[in-house]
C-alpha cells in the first residue's frame, strides 16, 4: 500500500485547485475505513492502482486520502429552500493526480489518473447518515453509493432511505 508522502507537499493551498472554475471550499487529509474498522488501502499493481478493504496489522500505517469539498446547488427546488438548497460534493485522491471514479457500467470504483477539470464520475455527494460516519453517493447516478463488496469497493444501489444506514455504505474518516 502507498500513502501520501509529506502532508505539506500534497495539501495544496485551497485556492490552488479549481474544477471548472470552482475551488474546493475546504480540504482534509484523512484515512478512510469501513463501519467495521477495516482500512481502505491503495496498491500499485501492473502499472495501475488497486483498491483494497483489509484489516491492517497493529502498527501498519493507514493510507491517507485527500478529500476536497465542493458546494453544489441541489438539482431540484422541491424542498422550498430556493437558493439555499446546497449539497456538499467530494472528490477523493489517494495520491497526486489520481482520483476515485465511479464506473457505473461495471458497478465498480476505480482509481484514474486525470487532469482538471475532473469528470462528473469523480464527484460524490457527501452524506452523514449516521453518527460519525459518512456515505458517498455518485453524482452521475443518484441512489448509487460507494460500498464494500467482497473486500473491494463497489457501487451499490440503495433503494430507499431506510437502507441509507446499511453498514456496507458507511465509512469513517480519521484525520489522525
Amino acid at each position: 500500500a502507498f500513502g501520501i508522502s509529506g502532508v505539506q507537499k500534497y495539501t495544496r493551498a485551497l485556492h490552488d485547485s479549481s474544477i471548472t472554475g470552482i475551488s474546493p471550499i475546504t480540504e482534509y487529509l484523512a484515512s478512510l475505513s469501513t463501519y467495521n474498522d477495516q482500512s481502505i488501502t491503495f496498491a500499485l499493481e501492473d502499472e495501475s492502482y488497486e483498491i483494497y478493504v483489509e484489516d491492517l496489522k497493529k502498527d501498519e500505517k493507514k493510507d491517507k486520502v485527500l478529500l476536497s469539498y465542493y458546494e453544489s446547488q441541489h438539482p431540484s427546488n422541491e424542498s422550498g429552500d430556493g437558493v439555499d438548497g446546497k449539497m456538499l460534493m467530494v472528490t477523493l485522491s489517494p495520491t497526486k493526480d489520481f482520483w476515485l471514479h465511479a464506473n457505473n457500467k461495471e458497478h465498480s470504483v476505480e482509481l484514474h489518473k486525470c487532469e482538471k477539470p475532473l469528470p462528473d464520475q469523480a464527484f460524490f455527494v457527501l452524506h452523514n447518515m449516521h453518527s460519525n460516519c459518512v456515505s458517498f453517493e455518485c453524482k452521475t447516478d443518484p441512489g448509487v453509493f460507494i460500498g464494500v463488496k467482497d473486500n473491494h469497493l463497489a457501487l451499490i444501489k440503495v433503494d430507499s432511505s431506510e437502507n441509507l444506514c446499511t453498514e456496507n455504505i458507511l465509512f469513517k474518516l480519521s484525520e489522525t
Epitope: L14, E78, S79, L88, L126, M129, H130, S131, L164, C165
Partner: antibody, heavy 122, light 107 residues
Framework: QVNLLQSGATLVKPGASMKMSCKAS????????VSWVKQSHGKSLEWIGE????????NFNKEFKDKATLTVDKSTSTAYMELTRLTSEDSAVYYC???????????????WGQGTLVTVSS | IIVMTQSPKSMSISVGDRVTMNCKAS??????IAWYRQKPGQSPELLIY???NRYTGVPDRFTGGGYGTDFTLTINSVQAEDAAFYYC?????????FGGGTKVELK
C-alpha cells in the same frame, strides 16, 4: 422560506425536567441535521448536540450527554430537546439551528429559531 | 477541546468606519471557522463560513480571512445595524466551540 419556530419561555423548579420543541417549515425536514445551542445570560454560545431526523442518529457535546435528550417527530417536522435534573446553571436561552447542506452536518448554523428561555428557580 | 479566543472584547466605532476583529484557535483548524453576528435581543445569524465564504444574502462589506490558527472578520463601512456581538466558531469537527465574542458598539 425556512422557519424554525420554538416553544415559549418556561419557568421550572430545580430538579425537574422540561421538554422544548422546534417546529421546522419551508424545507425538507428529514434531509438536514438539527443542532441545539445554549446561551446563558450575557455569555457566549455552547453547542449541545445534533440529530439527523432521517435516521435519528445523534452526536453530543460530552458536557451535555447526561443533561439533554434529542428526539424528532417526522410526521410533524418537529425536533425536541428534553433537559433533565435542572439546576440554576441550566437557566439560559436555547436555540435550535439548521445547517446549510442537505444530508451533511458540518456543524455550521445557517438558520436559527427565535430561542426558548428557560428559567430554573424555586 | 479547541479553545477559540476573540479580541478585542469590545470596540466603539462610528458609522462608515472599517473594523477588524480577531479570532485565535488553540490549535490548527485549517479554514474550519464560521462567524456570526448577534444583534441585541435577536438570534445569531451566519455571516462567514469556511473562513472566507460569505453566506447567502450577507452584504459584501463583511470579509473573512485567515488559515490555521489566526482569523479575522473585517467590516468595511460599518452600518448602524452592525452594532452587535460577533462570535467565531470552529466548524466541521465535534464538538464545535465558540469564541467569547467581540462587542461592537456605535459611538
Amino acid at each position: 422560506q425556512v422557519n424554525l419556530l420554538q416553544s415559549g419561555a418556561t419557568l421550572v423548579k430545580p430538579g425537574a425536567s422540561m421538554k422544548m420543541s422546534c417546529k421546522a417549515s419551508g424545507y425538507s425536514f428529514t434531509d438536514y441535521w438539527v443542532s441545539w445551542v445554549k446561551q446563558s445570560h450575557g455569555k457566549s454560545l455552547e453547542w449541545i448536540g445534533e440529530i439527523y431526523p432521517n435516521s435519528g442518529a445523534n452526536n453530543f457535546n460530552k458536557e451535555f450527554k447526561d443533561k439533554a435528550t434529542l428526539t424528532v417527530d417526522k410526521s410533524t417536522s418537529t425536533a425536541y430537546m428534553e433537559l433533565t435534573r435542572l439546576t440554576s446553571e441550566d437557566s439560559a436561552v436555547y436555540y435550535c439551528t439548521r445547517g446549510p447542506y442537505y444530508y451533511s452536518s458540518q456543524i455550521i448554523f445557517a438558520y436559527w429559531g427565535q430561542g426558548t428561555l428557560v428559567t430554573v428557580s424555586s | 477541546i479547541i479553545v477559540m479566543t476573540q479580541s478585542p472584547k469590545s470596540m466603539s466605532i462610528s458609522v462608515g468606519d472599517r473594523v477588524t476583529m480577531n479570532c485565535k484557535a488553540s490549535q490548527n483548524v485549517g479554514n474550519n471557522i464560521a462567524w456570526y453576528r448577534q444583534k441585541p435581543g435577536q438570534s445569531p445569524e451566519l455571516l462567514i463560513y469556511y473562513a472566507s465564504n460569505r453566506y447567502t444574502g450577507v452584504p459584501d462589506r463583511f470579509t473573512g480571512g485567515g488559515y490555521g490558527t489566526d482569523f479575522t472578520l473585517t467590516i468595511n463601512s460599518v452600518q448602524a445595524e452592525d452594532a452587535a456581538f460577533y462570535y467565531c466558531q470552529r466548524i466541521y469537527n465535534s464538538p464545535p466551540t465558540f469564541g467569547g465574542g467581540t462587542k461592537v458598539e456605535l459611538k
